[in-house]
Amino acid sequence: EVEKTACPSGKKAREIDESLIFYKKWELEACVDAALLATQMDRVNAIPFTYEQLDVLKHKLDELYPQGYPESVIQHLGYLFLKMSPEDIRKWNVTSLETLKALLEVNKGHEMSPQVATLIDRFVKGRGQLDKDTLDTLTAFYPGYLCSLSPEELSSVPPSSIWAVRPQDLDTCDPRQLDVLYPKARLAFQNMNGSEYFVKIQSFLGGAPTEDLKALSQQNVSMDLATFMKLRTDAVLPLTVAEVQKLLGPHVEGLKAEERHRPVRDWILRQRQDDLDTLGLGLQGGIPNGYLVLDLSMQEALS
């Protein structure tokens, strides 16, 4: 806390000026009017104030706006934003995408801080849904943003926003998140032709059900092994050898290298060895010839 002292003669600030970097903390407190600071926040960013000096400037704004800063001030906070706590940010009402961009720019190149997470949360809740422009902005700054959301939060993403998603944005998504995103992507890209559709939908396929994989196998898509390995095990298991062969096309040879890893391992265990042999890859572990496969789940359903 900076104690209240009178401003020395000749040091009263009439605008935010670069001479202020020489002011000590108590002089900034005494000589810089909070209302002046609020109207000239953009100038603060042009001046290399120390963190201690920024503490004083923040304190002045806090006193002026105890209920939270207005957006006109927030938009020009610049690197003073780094001084804000999540508690401070929860008092804000940020509605402008430009304000969001300006503050994300300050934190650019760093991990998502609790301040940024709170800011984004406030912004998205204020908008009611994660629209395309917002998603575009957030994934541009934080490629992993989408995968940091819960399936419940992802459910508010409108299909139109899916167009903003890049493959790298989904790198850290788990199956539960892809389960939510895949139907939205399918809806978003439904009017595209076969090959273009596959390019767009590919990174979302970790949420695809069996019937969609079967449909894709009829379209000569040549899915790469990396994509195949991210598919849901329960969606892959019912696929026949012929369907997997069609789905992977020339990439089918890669199954050998992955035969000990899920979902390939589990899929092999469900296939007849005869059928696996037709691939000519030396895949082992299939159901031996002459064995009868009982689908117990089907039996239970019938009873």
């Epitope: 000749g10 000026d17 001479s19 970097i21 020489f22 000589c31």
Partner: antibody, heavy 121, light 107 residues
């Protein structure tokens, strides 16, 4: 009364290094930003570098950036200028000066007598 | 960078005369100017800061004025000890700039 006394000047070869010191007395050294200003023989004044009272920020003229380093030890009331990769054009009298300021006005209110640095082979 | 140009380079006057020294900035500067006096073999001495405030111990015959791009140092009546070189100085963009100096010599 305020006194600033520079030392450490001398003859040095191009590419060499030198460390200047400025001993301050007669005022609370830790309350003031400090600076180095130089003057080549028969020429005008040229600002070199400045440092905040608490060493939180430092500033340099483009002509010395990357070669000179300003520092201070408030416990010893001393200002320093480490000069590396010296060139012939760095030859000058180097003054230590105290920085004072008002709103929109930053100036040097007290100066030392200077120490001569000669860079020559 | 802002360049400060002082004129004239040399001013030849007699004791008792009025000296008017000019300092012009290459662009409008929001900050205030300072003026220094330097005698041969001596360190500079602060005369005027904030464009018009006299430093401690500076005689009243020295006065400063101006703003924007044009600043003036006036010595109302030259004393023998006033014959020296005078420099203007500006703080801008976190660096300090000096003018090239005006030498006031005895006519």
């Amino acid at each position: 009364q305020v006194q600033l006394v520079e030392s450490g000047g001398g003859l040095v070869q191009p590419g060499g290094s030198l460390r200047l010191s400025c001993a301050a007395s007669g005022f609370t050294f830790s309350d003031y930003a400090m600076s180095w200003v130089r003057q080549a023989p028969g020429k005008g004044l040229e600002w070199v570098s400045a440092i905040m009272y608490d060493s939180s920020s430092t500033f340099y003229a483009d002509s010395v950036k990357g070669r000179f380093t300003i520092s201070r030890d408030n416990s010893k009331n001393t200002l320093y200028l480490q000069m590396n990769s010296l060139r012939a054009e760095d030859t000058a009298v180097y003054y230590c000066a105290r920085i004072n300021y008002i709103y929109k006005g930053v100036h040097f209110d007290y100066w030392g007598q200077g120490t001569l640095v000669t860079v020559s082979s | 960078d802002i360049v400060l140009t002082q004129s004239p380079a040399t001013l030849s006057l007699s004791p008792g005369e009025r000296a008017t020294l000019s300092c012009r900035a290459s662009q409008i500067v929001s900050g205030y100017l300072a003026w220094y006096q330097q005698k041969p073999g001596q360190a500079p001495r602060l005369l005027i800061y904030g464009a018009s405030s006299r430093a401690t111990g500076v005689p009243a015959r020295f006065s400063g004025s101006g703003s924007g791009t044009d600043f003036t140092l006036t010595i109302s009546s030259l004393e023998p000890e006033d014959f020296a070189t005078y420099y203007c100085q500006q703080y801008y963009n976190f660096s300090f700039t000096f003018g090239q100096g005006t030498k006031v010599e005895i006519k």
